[in-house]
Structure formats: structure tokens, C-alpha cells
């Protein structure tokens, strides 16, 4: 057992069909010595009497707000949350798989910029009862400071039968050197719980790993006279990291007909514009990515050719 | 990158196409490395992120744009120093490169290039015959070290008398190409910066 | 104690459905993920499908995905495993299993394919 | 397809040290605990060792269980008759958990 926060326990179960459970000793915080009971959430009946309690912790129905009184006045709470461990994995009942870019990806994180920021996010299906913390540090051993905000719903989608939720964090690197090459790799670690289930998960990477810059800014169209060829042209997005001759971006410029079965043209270039036939009907899409780095491309920014 | 590239005209920077040509060689050994050696801890999550260069060279600090110099976190240990040398800069007026970043980096691809060669050497001698270190790669090295035309001492190539543990050998080439590409990928961006200039 | 006791074995045609069950007692059934387990005539274990305790998960085997079904109603306390377009290769004592560090089995029920 | 392989068959006399290897990979037995199974002819497996090494109450001291990087074994320290059954170890990848992932097995026969 574990003190996750003030007055707040995890009990770490191993959980199988008809397992012993653990035995806790809960103590009322109090300087009381008499005539001390217990009781579990809202239930007035009476568990034990005295300054301690011993229970023995097996299911859920163990778990819960266990609080001590005296005389119809409240002392102290003590709430027991469950942490499963199933043949030896800690249980994930709360975070949906989102399988992406392996299996057994619960947080996925993405930085637009070298400055030290990134978000992380994460889906479930549960919509009540659920709570979020994380923390986050640059290596393990000796950690080095990631200050993280709140989690909070990011957004609602409707998948099948079920809705989804998606939470989503902001951290910032304390000291962060944009050309720095990291060594130690960044930990994020978000408890979550649900009612009275309490699971961890973490995610560690480096930040050159999770790049993926915004779309290319200004995106424009220049006909060439007498020419089906257009010359195309966009701006670095403002959130990359400068100077730009340093943080070089690379450029993916693709044509692409109304018709998603049509031909895509495609050019590659370290330029902010290139030369290409503009098709009726066609857009003109652009995309960045580190030029030395191949991490992920950023989404695309698009114009029409008309 | 695997992807057709329009590249810009290195010419008057010569440094900067050895750069591109050398963070293209050691992509390939990665990706060579991480697919023969499926078997061995070989990915980024895998590895301990070694430095070899670690407290030898500064080349990060030293070859720090001029506009991230106000950023106190890229600051720690930098040693500023604004005399420019090597043919890399021929005759090109700049204030953002010193002798200090091109020997710097000189020094790291000797570094490297060493331990590179005293590792093919154990390779050559393994009789699963596995993995050797490509001939491009280490001759890339030579070409940008030669475009940098700095003078030091050659460093003798470390010989080893006992028999040498291939699985250890292996996962050391790992960890090596590992931190030679991100260290690439600096010179990369020092390079391009430059060019800029 | 706990105990799982299987049913609805027997002889199939290739191309026919068949539905087997596994009803349990002794525990709180709606607490723990439950596994599919199978055993071909003189062969290996072989792992069919998992459900969560809450039936939100499926999890299946690439040799009975999009055949087999792995479904469970609580308020029965019952495993089952609908077993659609058949195959000789599925002939096999089938096992319920329980999920964790102590596991617990079902009797196992044969499922013989055969035309 | 077993990815976690066993050897077909081992023997032993009455009182002999029998081993039972099961060999893995860094995704499954290198990441995650191993159980040992015994299953007598007819029967469902039973559980001898989980956790690597750590034996269920009712199960005879004889049988012990390890595990070190990517390999785990099974010992019988003196085989008896009532041994003779096939055994398997269970463990999990750590991409397709909770797919139980079984080895080949493995046939104890008991001479003499």
C-alpha cells in the first residue's frame, strides 16, 4: 500500500479468482483513543471499533472511503483505491489502445518545435468518475524539471455505439536548448482513476522523435504566363523553431485531383516554392518536415487551383 | 530519406554537401544495423544514449547560432571564440562561425572514425560474418575531414588483444550509430546555417 | 470455490456454427478477463480469444478472427464462444480459462469438425 | 506458430534432475513473467510455476522455475513416475498481451 495523496491509498492487488487479497491497517488520524468506530462510504454500518481498523483488501467492494467517528463526528477519511495486476501486468481497463505507432500505445505525444513544449494525449470511453494527473521529467534517475498543466477534455467523438473522450496535456521543459542533442529522454506519467481503479501509464521519448511541425503558412499560386505551370509558394508555419537556416525544413508538394483515384504528382524540395501543372479541379497541397530528422510530416495545407 | 530530392547547388559552401552526404551514410548503416541486427537490442528505446565525444569536443555549444545565444539553457558550457579558420570557410566573412565549432566537429568525425575502424576490425573477425560497416559511411568521414583541412594529430587506431565479444561489439555499434547520427544531424544544421550566412 | 464447467461440444459440419459455454461460480465472475483456449488432437496449447472483465475488449487469434465470436453475460456468470464457418483445423478440446497470475480451467469440451 | 520453443522430449530415471528449457525473444519472455504448465493425458493443464519462479500452494517442492533474459527453464529435481506428462511454459508479448503466448512443449517420460 501507497499513499497516492493525502488520505488517498492504492492497494496493489494481485488479481485473480479467489486471491487472498492484502491485509491493511488503516490508523484514524486523531489524538483520540476511545470510543473511536468505522464505517465504509455510506453505509452506517458499524466495521470495527478503535484506532485502527485491519481489513483484508480482495475486491472493490474493499475498496472505498473508510472513515473514522466519534460521537457522530467525523475524525478522519482514509480512501482505498485498487491497483490490478493481471499475471503480472498492471491492469489498462481506463485508457483506450490507440495502437499507434505500435501496440500498446495508451499516450501519444507531439512537439511542433524544439523550444522543450509538447502535448500529449489520450483516449477513453469513460465519461464520469475520472480524474487525471501527470507529471512529467527528462530521464529517470536524476530527474531533470517538465512542468505539466492540468489535463483536460480535448475532445468528443462517436465511434460505433460507444463515445470516445480525448484528454490532452501541455508540458513545457524548464531549461530547454533547442539545438541541444538529447541524451536522456523525456518521461511523461499520467495516473488515472476511475471510481475506485487506479492505473498508471508512461510514455518516454525524445523530443526530436515526436517533431511534427505545423503546415506551411501562406501557401500561394502564381501562374506562369503562357504556361499551364504555376508557381507555388509558402512561408515556414510561425510555431517552428529559428533560425530557419538551422531548423531547415524539408517540403513535400503534391497535386492531387478531385477524384481520390487520380494521379498524385509529387515533388520533394528544400525550397518555399516549386513549379508545377495545375490541373482544372485540382488542389495544390504542401507539407513539412524536418529536413535532417525524418520524424512525422506536418498535416497538409492545401489551395485550390482554380 | 528514400525520397527524390530537388537539393539546392552546395557550391559555394563545399562543407555542406559533404554534411548532407555524410547524414545520408550514416542513416543507411542505421537502418542496415536495425534490420540485420533484429535480434539485438539495436532501436532507440533500446540503447543507452552514449556520447563518445562527451567532455572531448563542444561542437553543440561551440557551433550555437548567434540567435540562441541569448537562450540561457544553450548556454552551460560555451566557449566563445569568433576566429574563423579552415577551407570549409574559404574567404566567406561570418560571425557565427569560430575555429573552435570546425575543429570541433573535425574532432568528433576523428573520434568517430577511430572507433568506427577498430570496430570493422572485430566485425571482419566474427564468424557469423553478420554486419560490417559500410565503406561509404567511412569514407564520407575522410572527404568531410579533408574538406575541413584542419591539422591534429592522428589518433592510432585502438587495438585490442583479447577475443573480442561479438554480441558486445554489436550492440556497441548500436549505441554508436545512434549518437553518430544525431551528432550528424548537427553538423547538418551548423553547416546549412553557415551556408546561409 | 472457484469452478468453470464447459458446454456445447460435439460434431460439426465444415461451414456450420456452434456455440460453447462456460458457466462460472465460486468468485465474482464480472471481475475478471476470461481466455478461449483450444488443443488439436496430439498437438500444443493454443491461445483463442480474451474478453475484459467488462466485455469492452475482444482480443483474437489470427487463425479464428472474423469466425469466432468470444462474448459474456454477467448477470449469468457465463463465457461463451461462437464458433461460425468451421474448419477440420478447428477440431480441438476447447478450454475456458480464467486471467491471472492462478488460473483456473474448464473441463475442456471437443469440437470435432468433420463432414 | 509457437514462438516459444521447447524441446520435443526429455527423460529421466527415478530421482534424476530433469530440465525443460523454453526459449524466447526481448518482446515476450525478455519482457514479461513465465508460467509452467504440467498436463497429464486427458486432463486440463495445471499450473505448476508463475511469476518465473514462484510455486502455487499443492504444487511438490521438486518443481522449481527460472528465468534469465530471454530463456526461462523448468526443473524436476528428482523425477517421479507420476511426473510423465507433457509440460508448457506460458508467457506474453508485449505488443499482442493478453494473447497467451504457449510453447511447443515438452514430453517427460520417466525410465525404468
Known amino acids: 500500500i501507497w499513499e497516492l495523496k493525502k488520505d488517498v491509498y492504492v492497494v496493489e492487488l494481485d488479481w485473480y479468482p479467489d486471491a487472498p487479497g492484502e491485509m491493511v491497517v488503516l490508523t484514524c488520524d486523531t489524538p483520540e483513543e476511545d470510543g473511536i468506530t468505522w464505517t465504509l462510504d455510506q453505509s452506517s454500518e458499524v466495521l470495527g471499533s478503535g484506532k485502527t481498523l485491519t481489513i483484508q483488501v480482495k475486491e472493490f467492494g474493499d475498496a472505498g472511503q473508510y472513515t473514522c467517528h466519534k460521537g457522530g463526528e467525523v475524525l478522519s477519511h482514509s480512501l482505498l483505491l485498487l491497483h490490478k495486476k493481471e499475471d503480472g501486468i498492471w491492469s489498462t481497463d481506463i485508457l483506450k489502445d490507440q495502437k499507434e505507432p505500435k501496440n500498446k500505445t495508451f499516450l501519444r505525444c507531439e512537439a511542433k518545435n524544439y523550444s522543450g513544449r509538447f502535448t500529449c494525449w489520450w483516449l477513453t470511453t469513460i465519461s464520469t468518475d475520472l480524474t487525471f494527473s501527470v507529471k512529467s521529467s527528462r530521464g529517470s534517475s536524476d530527474p531533470q524539471g517538465v512542468t505539466c498543466g492540468a489535463a483536460t477534455l480535448s475532445a468528443e467523438r462517436v465511434r460505433g455505439d460507444n463515445k470516445e473522450y480525448e484528454y490532452s496535456v501541455e508540458c513545457q521543459e524548464d531549461s530547454a536548448c533547442p539545438a541541444a542533442e538529447e541524451s536522456l529522454p523525456i518521461e511523461v506519467m499520467v495516473d488515472a482513476v476511475h471510481k475506485l481503479k487506479y492505473e498508471n501509464y508512461t510514455s518516454s521519448f525524445f523530443i526530436r522523435d515526436i517533431i511534427k511541425p505545423d503546415p506551411p503558412k501562406n501557401l500561394q499560386l502564381k501562374p506562369l504566363k503562357n504556361s499551364r505551370q504555376v508557381e507555388v509558394s509558402w512561408e515556414y508555419p510561425d510555431t517552428w523553431s529559428t533560425p530557419h537556416s538551422y531548423f531547415s525544413l524539408t517540403f513535400c508538394v503534391q497535386v492531387q485531383g478531385k477524384s481520390k483515384r487520380e494521379k498524385k504528382d509529387r515533388v520533394f524540395t528544400d525550397k518555399t516554392s516549386a513549379t508545377v501543372i495545375c490541373r482544372k479541379n485540382a488542389s495544390i497541397s504542401v507539407r513539412a518536415q524536418d529536413r535532417y530528422y525524418s520524424s512525422s510530416w506536418s498535416e497538409w495545407a492545401s489551395v485550390p487551383c482554380s | 530519406r528514400n525520397l527524390p530530392v530537388a537539393t539546392p547547388d552546395p557550391g559555394m559552401f563545399p562543407c555542406l554537401h559533404h554534411s548532407q552526404n555524410l547524414l545520408r551514410a550514416v542513416s543507411n548503416m542505421l537502418q542496415k544495423a536495425r534490420q540485420t541486427l533484429e535480434f539485438y537490442p539495436c532501436t532507440s528505446e533500446e540503447i543507452d544514449h552514449e556520447d563518445i565525444t562527451k567532455d572531448k569536443t563542444s561542437t553543440v555549444e561551440a557551433c550555437l547560432p548567434l540567435e540562441l545565444t541569448k537562450n540561457e539553457s544553450c548556454l552551460n558550457s560555451r566557449e566563445t571564440s569568433f576566429i574563423t579558420n579552415g577551407s570549409c570557410l574559404a574567404s566567406r566573412k561570418t560571425s557565427f562561425m569560430m575555429a573552435l565549432c570546425l575543429s570541433s566537429i573535425y574532432e568528433d568525425l576523428k573520434m568517430y572514425q577511430v572507433e568506427f575502424k577498430t570496430m570493422n576490425a572485430k566485425l571482419l573477425m566474427d564468424p557469423k560474418r553478420q554486419i560490417f560497416l559500410d565503406q561509404n559511411m567511412l569514407a564520407v568521414i575522410d572527404e568531410l575531414m579533408q574538406a575541413l583541412n584542419f591539422n591534429s594529430e592522428t589518433v592510432p587506431q585502438k587495438s585490442s588483444l583479447e577475443e573480442p565479444d561479438f554480441y558486445k561489439t554489436k550492440i556497441k555499434l548500436c549505441i554508436l550509430l545512434h549518437a553518430f547520427r544525431i551528432r550528424a544531424v548537427t553538423i547538418d544544421r551548423v553547416m546549412s546555417y553557415l551556408n546561409a550566412s | 470455490q472457484v469452478q468453470l464447467v464447459q458446454s456445447g461440444g460435439g460434431v460439426v459440419q465444415p461451414g456450420r456454427s456452434l456455440r460453447l459455454s462456460c458457466a462460472a461460480s465460486g468468485f465474482t465472475f464480472s471481475e475478471y478477463g476470461m481466455h478461449w483456449v483450444r488443443q488439436a488432437p496430439g498437438k500444443g496449447l493454443e491461445w483463442v480469444a480474451f474478453i475484459r472483465y467488462d466485455g469492452s475488449n475482444k482480443y483474437y487469434a489470427d487463425s479464428v478472427k472474423g469466425r469466432f465470436t468470444i462474448s459474456r453475460d454477467n448477470s449469468k456468470n457465463t463465457l461463451y464462444l461462437q464458433m461460425k464457418s468451421l474448419r477440420a483445423e478447428d477440431t480441438a478440446v476447447y478450454y475456458c480459462?480464467?486471467?491471472?497470475?492462478?488460473?483456473?480451467w474448464g473441463q475442456g469440451t471437443m469440437v470435432t469438425v468433420s463432414s | 506458430s509457437y514462438v516459444l520453443t521447447q524441446p520435443p522430449s526429455v527423460s529421466g530415471t527415478p530421482g534424476q534432475r530433469v530440465t525443460i528449457s523454453c526459449s524466447g525473444g526481448?518482446?515476450?519472455?525478455?519482457?514479461?513473467?513465465v508460467k509452467w504448465y504440467q498436463q497429464l493425458p486427458g486432463t486440463a493443464p495445471k499450473l505448476l510455476i508463475y511469476y518465473n519462479d514462484q510455486r502455487p500452494s499443492g504444487v511438490p517442492d521438486r518443481f522449481s522455475g527460472s528465468k534469465s533474459g530471454t530463456s526461462a527453464s523448468l526443473a524436476i529435481t528428482g523425477v517421479q513416475a507420476e511426473d510423465e506428462a507433457d509440460y508448457y511454459c506460458?508467457?506474453?508479448?508485449?505488443?499482442?498481451?493478453?494473447?497467451?503466448?504457449f510453447g511447443t512443449g515438452t514430453k517427460v517420460t520417466v525410465l525404468g
Open positions: 480459462k480464467t486471467h491471472g497470475s492462478h488460473d483456473n
Open positions: 506460458q508467457s506474453y508479448d508485449r505488443y499482442t498481451h493478453p494473447a497467451l503466448l
Open positions: 526481448r518482446s515476450n519472455i525478455g519482457s514479461n513473467t
